[in-house]
């Protein structure tokens, strides 16, 4: 019941985390720049890590997809690069679990097969998490080493004056929300792990051995207790009865009333 | 670089009309607001009006209801008519924007001018 409960758990705590990996990879609010008040009217500006905006005060809103931008920098390539593989392991670890789920009854299926499915996708869900907490991070450590804060400049060319303004780059919603999404998916994937242990089948130190007996008459040869106990030398429970005794592996079974287990 | 031209300017009668044009240039990836400043000899620069990229627009109490502005967002374009042009509308006509650069990213802003247009009134 409680591995039914942590796998259904960590299943949920996923989910959630990965509906918000893939928010935050959407969002346009990866950074935000300081509102500045021009005279015509209060603009402010944020970035995403496929388009920006423009926000005014009136409440118009534009924004412009990174196409026409000459050059993108490799490590906003690589925040894309981790966010996206983090969505995609976490929807394949997504449909796996559902398929794994101890809840869900898929033909005969047997425990063993789910809980290495279960821990398939819990390993899925920690590298879908620490993808876009890497990415979040990188982003992050992006904004607080290179662009924190614009010089504000002043030059004079052909055409005027060109002065830059001075914005502040300050960490936006997309990346607190793609942190938090990043734990849950990872906390998830634990659970998942966590859940494989109980799903598994305890291997026990010896096999089962069924005697089957050929005639109507059994004898049993001395050190039977050893061979089937596994506390003699014969600990691989290879066959040592002439009289049909054979291991759970090899055995078929046929119905007779001469059957003894 | 990125670039403001102004044309339209010369000598025109009181009661006249005239029309400015500014033209943005360069590797511009968006323009926020653009605007209109003119400064008269011995005075200060001022706003005379401005577009945001929305549509919002403003104006100077002296030139309300005299001067319209309006921009091609296509052609990345600002315009200015001017119409009952006074004496005291006199001066050396700036165009200003708050524009993206194309050339970095995250997008860097930047408040760009032009190297002005005289507009003279005079009888």
């Known amino acids: 019941m409680a591995v039914t409960a942590c796998q259904g758990l960590g299943f949920v705590v996923s989910l959630i985390g990965i509906a918000g990996i893939i928010a935050a990879t959407c969002m346009d609010q990866w950074s935000t720049q300081d509102l500045y008040n021009n005279p015509v009217t209060a603009v402010f500006n944020y970035q995403g890590l496929w388009r920006s905006c423009v926000r005014e005060s009136s409440g118009f809103t534009e924004c412009r997809g990174y196409f026409t931008l000459l050059g993108l920098p490799a490590m906003l390539q690589a925040v894309r690069a981790l966010m996206i593989v983090g969505i995609v392991l976490g929807a394949i670890g997504l449909l796996v679990s559902i398929f794994a789920l101890k809840c869900i009854r898929i033909g005969s299926m047997e425990d063993s097969a789910k809980a290495n499915m279960t821990l398939t996708s819990g390993i899925m869900f920690i590298v879908s998490g620490l993808c876009a907490i890497a990415g979040v991070s990188v982003f992050a450590n992006m904004l607080v080493t290179n662009f924190w804060m614009s010089t504000a400049n002043m030059y004079t060319g052909m055409g005027g004056m060109v002065q830059t303004v001075q914005t502040r780059y300050t960490f936006g919603a997309a990346l607190f929300v793609g942190w938090v999404a990043g734990g849950l998916t990872l906390i998830g994937g634990v659970m998942m792990c966590i859940a494989c242990r109980g799903l598994a089948p305890e291997e026990t130190n010896y096999k089962a051995v069924s005697y089957h007996a050929s005639g109507h008459s059994v004898a049993y040869k001395p050190g039977g207790f050893k061979a089937s106990t596994g506390f003699g030398s014969n600990t691989k429970n290879k066959k040592i009865y002439d009289g049909g005794a054979r291991t759970e592996d090899e055995v078929q079974s046929y119905p007779s009333k001469h059957d003894y287990v | 670089e990125v670039q403001l031209v102004e044309s339209g300017g010369g000598l025109v009668q009181p009661g006249g009309s005239l029309r400015l044009s500014c033209a943005a240039s360069?590797?511009?990836?968006?323009?926020?607001?653009m605007s209109w400043y003119r400064q008269a000899p011995g005075k200060q620069r001022e706003l005379v009006a401005g577009i945001s990229a929305g549509g919002t627009t403003r104006y100077a109490d002296s030139v309300k209801g005299r001067f319209t502005i309006s921009r091609d967002n296509a052609k990345n374009t600002l315009y200015l008519q001017m119409n009952s042009l006074r004496a005291e509308d006199t001066a050396v006509y700036y165009c200003?924007?708050?524009?993206?650069?194309?050339?970095?990213?995250?997008?860097?802003?930047?408040?760009?001018w032009g190297q002005g247009t005289l507009v003279t009134v005079s009888s």
């Open positions: 360069g590797s511009i990836f968006s323009i926020n607001v």
């Open positions: 200003n924007a708050d524009l993206a650069e194309a050339t970095s990213w995250p997008v860097r802003y930047l408040e760009v």
